[in-house]
Interface confidence: low
């Protein structure tokens, strides 16, 4: 999906009002220095591409993020403020339904959500300072 047509200010507002708090809740009990940020982005569309990938694509050791509150709110924000986004996500929704129903917070998931926090922070202050 091409995120260049999204309403970035509205997505930023959604992040600041709710998504950021849900990410903090998920990470509660984890030290902020525990994980190194290895994923970055160079501008807002690029950040949203990386955020979508980390939030909704199951990875080895972390298959369940899509059912978390921050993920559902992220999906809603993208669906509302990115024209045509919902239509591109039909296959992704089918895959999500097949994911395990139980929420398991693994260390890998915590690391992934830590990366997401960094991407969202970068989304609010775009422009990668070092490529």
């Amino acid at each position: 999906y091409d995120f260049t047509n999204c309403d970035f200010e509205k997505i930023k507002a959604a992040y600041l009002s709710t998504i950021s708090k849900d990410l903090i809740t998920y990470m509660s009990g984890t030290k902020s220095t525990e994980f190194n940020n290895t994923v970055s982005c160079s501008n807002r569309p690029h950040c949203l591409t990386e955020i979508q990938s980390l939030t909704f694509n199951p990875t080895a050791g972390c298959a369940s993020l899509a059912k978390e509150m921050f993920a559902m709110k992220t999906k809603a924000a993208l669906a509302i403020w990115c024209p045509g986004y919902s239509e591109t996500q039909i296959n992704a929704t089918q895959a999500m339904k097949k994911a395990r129903k139980s929420k398991v917070t693994t260390n890998k998931c915590l690391e992934q959500v830590s990366q997401l926090q960094g991407l969202w922070r970068r989304f609010n202050r775009p422009l990668l300072k070092q490529q």
Epitope: D2, T4, N43, P45, H46, P126
Partner: antibody, heavy 117, light 107 residues
């Protein structure tokens, strides 16, 4: 109305320094990065580097690292770009330009720096 | 560093002509490309960003497109005020780089 107003033309001798200013108005100064772009006479545009006005973090391309110092004064919403040890090849028009996503929606009017003995 | 190769370096055209300027990136920059217009003695002006989004106040005769690493700026019907130099610039990450420019002259 967004405006970037740069300081006037400068004529300097080789070896001297010059400080170009770029005063921003009409928007929140710390929200946007400030970039500087060089245009030598009859040449194209060359990106020099950028400064984040919120924390003064700068990124310069290698060729300008020993030549350029970028600073900001948040109290006056002004960005500065200082060129040191001036040589003839520093003769150019220097532009400030603001950006959020890497493209420049507003530019200063340009400051001509002439280095001549 | 990402290199931006712009062509042609200059072209002659008449009012009403369709003009196409291309820019090729040395690697994938997705849609992160801007186009600027510069007239003699003036600052560059943003025309297009994210490869195909028209900047505010830019006439609809200007359009941008992308195919892989090749980007195109098209002026559908050249007007007298369009005679200028045009630059592409990638905005994918540091260091930002510009194309060499295309000077559009009156035939």
């Amino acid at each position: 109305e967004v405006q970037l107003v740069q300081s006037g033309a400068e004529v300097k001798k080789p070896g001297a320094s010059v400080k170009v200013s770029c005063k921003a108005s009409g928007y929140t100064f710390t929200t946007y990065w400030m970039h500087w772009v060089k245009q030598a006479p009859g040449q194209g545009l060359e990106w020099m580097g950028m400064i984040d006005p919120s924390d003064s973090e700068t990124t310069l391309i290698q060729k300008f690292k020993d030549k350029v110092t970028m600073t900001v004064d948040k109290s006056t919403s002004t960005a500065y770009m200082e060129l040191s040890s001036l040589r003839s090849e520093d003769t150019a028009v220097y532009y400030c330009a603001r950006t959020l996503d890497g493209y420049y929606d507003y530019w200063g009017q340009g400051t001509t720096v002439t280095v001549s003995s | 560093d990402i290199q931006m190769t712009q062509s042609p370096s200059s072209l002659s055209a008449s009012v009403g002509d369709r003009v196409t300027i291309t820019c090729r990136a040395s690697e994938n920059i997705y849609s992160y490309l801007a186009w600027y217009q510069q007239k003699p003695g003036k600052s560059p002006q943003l025309l297009v960003y994210f490869a195909k989004t028209l900047a505010e106040g830019v006439p609809s005769r200007f359009s941008g497109s992308v195919s892989g690493t090749q980007f195109t700026l098209t002026i559908s019907s050249l007007q007298p005020e369009d005679f200028a130099t045009y630059y592409c610039q990638h905005h994918y990450g540091t260091p930002w780089t510009f194309g060499g420019g295309t000077k559009v002259e009156i035939k």
